[in-house]
């Protein structure tokens, strides 16, 4: 149960994560204009991953699409590389994912599949989550660079008399969604690659013992018992000398630290 | 088509207060910025504020904070401008105006006439 | 504030006759973000409102004749009128539609000789 549980909780919150790289991918919010200790302008800007924005104080909004990719700052590029690896290699997990999933049955797929592909899954999905936050974490850094730059030569201007006032950017309400849709992504992933382990075939913990019957001679090998898929009880596979004989099902219906993840 | 009505002529007393109103027809009136600028007689220009009447949200400018006080009523698609504690000073042409592209004011009320004297 | 710098004060000007009026900031109202000068032109007649002429420096509002140009960048815009008609006798006004407070020059007046 408890398996099941850390597999569809792992799925949900993978799920709720690559939404969010998405959406953060798509927001125009990256960066926003710095509004602390500026002049009080009738407009506002903010810049996102493929469009930058102006909303002028009459409400009208304005956005203006980068349709050069040569012209675009190499940081800028690998920030979308980053994402949209990361919306990828997620997706693909959770198609793996749906079908690794404990609770749904397709065909006679055996649990050692399930968990190979629970496996992948979670694996993708890390390294979906990491992608996003490096990402984010790259474009942040940007911002910051940026931000003192432009904060030291903040004015120009002819001997003090016309100034010019860059505009400064901070961080934009993307960013916070990106870093907390990666780190969602990220523990999906690693509540899938623990239950992953919850799923793998068990080794037995007794030693091949021969049988000599009549005729010919038969070796039972251990490991050969195949994990329950969860539907209906498998009271033919017992667990030898775990310290009684226990069904897999009340196996799973014990707590685990599983339960609480 | 786009109309800012505005209120009558006022003859005001010093120290008195006059609210005068800036009625919108002919467009949505929560969509818009509703600016109000002074005229003095013969004399340039000068910005006081502004109201949202989306949400009641102002903006004025330091010189004309707690002389004035914008208000709005979504109801009536109606503006208001108060002034209190009027002087001389205080005597000129009040005018609305609605915002848009490029943050200009592109329809401006008729104006409003306010003259203070004892 | 804002500082809006209008010259010259005033403009003689015969019917035909071409004329450029000027309007300086202390700032650049220039924003980078849409590459857009925040600048407006009004012209306003005795006993009347201000009218919108241009926004955005260049962009004339609809039912602006053509022959009211607005031109410039960063601090320094100019108003042109290629030919003056008589109708075009009024002040003209520029304002900085970039930082709050909003702020407007002192005008222009376009005079008949």
């Known amino acids: 149960m408890a398996v099941t549980a850390c597999q569809g909780l792992g799925f949900v919150v993978s799920l709720i994560g690559i939404a969010g790289i998405i959406a953060a991918t798509c927001m125009d919010q990256w960066s926003t204009q710095d509004l602390y200790n500026n002049p009080v302008t009738a407009v506002f800007n903010y810049q996102g991953l493929w469009r930058s924005c102006v909303r002028e104080s009459s409400g009208f909004t304005e956005c203006r699409g980068y349709f050069t990719l040569l012209g675009l700052p190499a940081m800028l590029q690998a920030v979308r590389a980053l994402m949209i690896v990361g919306i990828v290699l997620g997706a693909i997990g959770l198609l793996v994912s749906i079908f690794a999933l404990k609770c749904i049955r397709i065909g006679s797929m055996e649990d050692s599949a399930k968990a190979n592909m629970t496996l992948t899954s979670g694996i993708m999905f890390i390294v979906s989550g990491l992608c996003a936050i490096a990402g984010v974490s790259v474009f942040a850094n940007m911002l910051v660079t940026n931000f003192w730059m432009s904060t030291a030569n903040m004015y120009t201007g002819m001997g003090g008399m016309v100034q010019t006032v860059q505009t400064r950017y901070t961080f934009g309400a993307a960013l916070f969604v990106g870093w907390v849709a990666g780190g969602l992504t990220l523990i999906g992933g690693v509540m899938m690659c623990i239950a992953c382990r919850g799923l793998a075939p068990e080794e037995t913990n007794y030693k091949a013992v021969s049988y000599h019957a009549s005729g010919h001679s038969v070796a039972y090998k251990p490991g050969g018992f195949k994990a329950s898929t969860g539907f209906g009880s498998n009271t033919k596979n017992k667990k030898i000398y775990d310290g009684g004989a226990r069904t897999e099902d009340e196996v799973q219906s014990y707590p685990s630290k599983h339960d609480y993840v | 088509e786009v109309q800012l009505q505005q209120s009558g002529p006022e003859l005001v007393k010093p120290g008195a207060s006059v609210k005068m109103s800036c009625k919108a027809s002919?467009?949505?009136?929560?969509?818009?910025?509703m600016h109000w600028v002074k005229q003095k007689p013969g004399q340039g220009l000068e910005w006081i504020g502004y109201?949202?009447?989306?949400?009641?949200?102002?903006k004025y400018s330091e010189k004309f904070k707690g002389k004035a006080t914008l208000t709005s009523d979504k109801s009536s698609s109606t503006a208001f401008m108060e002034l209190s504690s009027l002087t001389s000073d205080d005597s000129a042409v009040y005018y609305c105006?609605?915002?848009?592209?490029?943050?200009?004011?592109?329809?401006w009320g008729q104006g409003t006439s306010v003259t203070v004297s004892s | 504030d804002i500082v809006m710098t209008q010259s010259p004060s005033s403009l003689t000007v015969t019917a035909g006759e071409r004329v450029t009026m000027r309007c300086r900031s202390t700032?650049?109202?220039?924003?980078?973000?849409?590459?857009?000068?925040?600048l407006t032109w009004y012209q306003q007649k005795p006993g009347q409102p201000p009218k919108l002429l241009i926004y955005?420096?260049?962009t004339r509002e609809s039912g602006v004749p053509d022959r009211f140009t607005g031109g410039g960048s960063g601090t320094d815009f100019t108003l042109t009128i290629s030919s003056v008609q008589a109708e075009d006798l009024a002040v003209y006004y520029c304002?900085?539609?970039?930082?709050?407070?909003?702020?407007f020059g002192a005008g222009t007046k376009l005079e008949r000789k």
């Open positions: 109201i949202n009447p989306y949400n009641d949200g102002t």
């Open positions: 700032q650049s109202l220039f924003n980078s973000g849409n590459q857009k000068n925040y």
């Open positions: 105006a609605r915002l848009d592209y490029g943050n200009a004011m592109d329809y």
């Open positions: 955005w420096a260049s």
């Open positions: 002919g467009y949505t009136f929560t969509g818009f910025l």
């Open positions: 304002q900085n539609a970039y930082y709050y407070p909003l702020t």
